[in-house]
């Protein structure tokens, strides 16, 4: 619009002046005046500000507490927060990843559909007909039943979702 109907995008209004905001990584020391420019200072070590701002204090970087199973995935800068993730075998309990829990295992009769990551839990699925899982595991998928025919054997015991079929020799008495 002409003329402007507000301060420009990276400005804020204070005492009738449109002052520049501080850029990411810097905090506000003093507002601009008729005589002076906005004064900004870089955030200190272990601090950040990720937007154009008029904050007088920088935010502290997130602490990845190893007691909660956390570790640093990406170190923070003056413009970005630290990103935490979980130790191997654990995953975040929330999007903010403030704590971790052990990956769940899939019980017998269930297989792993999707292996867990640092941010998502194991996804299990029931073993369909023709497949089984006889272990509790966070990695094992459902295995297909053994094909007795390909081994020139016959099914002696039918398989379930938890057990494989049992193959045996063909009955030689049958013509």
């Amino acid at each position: 619009p002409e003329p402007p109907t507000a301060c420009r995008e990276k400005q804020y209004l204070i005492n009738s002046q449109c002052c520049s905001l501080c850029q990411p990584g810097q905090k506000l020391v003093s507002d601009c005046t008729e005589f002076t420019e906005t004064e900004c200072l870089p955030c200190g070590e272990s601090e950040f500000l990720d937007t154009w701002n008029r904050e007088t204090h920088c935010h502290q970087h997130k602490y990845c507490d190893p007691n909660l199973g956390l570790r640093v995935q990406q170190k923070g800068t003056s413009e970005t927060d630290t990103i935490c993730t979980c130790e191997e075998g654990w995953h975040c309990t929330s999007e903010a990843c403030e704590s971790c829990v052990l990956h769940r295992s899939c019980s017998p009769g269930f297989g792993v559909k999707q292996i867990a990551t640092g941010v998502s839990d194991t996804i299990c699925e029931p073993c369909p007909v023709g497949f089984f899982s006889n272990v509790s595991s966070a990695f094992e998928k459902c295995h297909p039943w053994t094909s007795c025919e390909t081994k020139d054997l016959v099914v002696q015991q039918a398989g379930t979702n938890k057990t494989d079929v049992v193959c045996g020799p063909q009955d030689r008495l049958r013509a």
């Epitope: 003329p3 109907t5 301060c7 420009r8 990276k10 400005q11 009738s16 002046q17 520049s20 850029q23």
Partner: antibody, heavy 125, light 107 residues
Amino acid sequence: QVQLVQSGAEVKKPGASVKVSCKASGYTFAGYYMYWVRQAPGQGLEWMGWINPDSGAPTYAQKFQGRVTMTRDTSISTAYMELSRLRSDDTAVYYCAREKIYYGSGNYYPSFDYWGQGTLVTVSS
Amino acid sequence: DIQLTQSPSFLSASVGDRVTITCRASQGISSYLAWYQQKPGKAPKLLIYAASTLQSGVPSRFSGSGSGTEFTLTISSLQPEDFATYYCQQLISYPWTFGQGTKVEIK
């Protein structure tokens, strides 16, 4: 203190292009719009347009549309104005100027509070 | 485009004189007007914005008034350093045009 320092004088032939730079210091470059104004020898001031240094989006005066390109490099706090297909009547001093906005009586009033020292562009065959 | 007409174009005055420069707009521009001073070989310098607000660092002998289509710049007591060319500028409608200038010379 705020300073706008422009590139040196240029002599160009008709049909050529010229690119003038304007290096800003003493303030947050991306926080203020930058304007370009020219002044032919012994003449008045002529507004050419502006650039938003944050987004890089320019707005040009109709008269210069298609011939002028305004750009910026935020990493070095510098604005540029390039004028192509130069003619002899483009001979002028080219200025960059920073916009200031004052709020009063419910309105936002712009003006140009800091100017570069000017760059003389001479177009001659 | 909005036309700005300054009068007079030339003005001869002595140190200590009260000087008034007029700027007329071809259509109403509310208070979206600025005044600049320019000395030979130098960039313009902002004196007044929003028609009547004095820019910081500018001596109080300079004042601006007016609204709509008629504006004035007044120098209450002309000083030797005030001999220069003065421009008005409208900032309400693109292109933000300038007046043709008023040259203040020593009598």
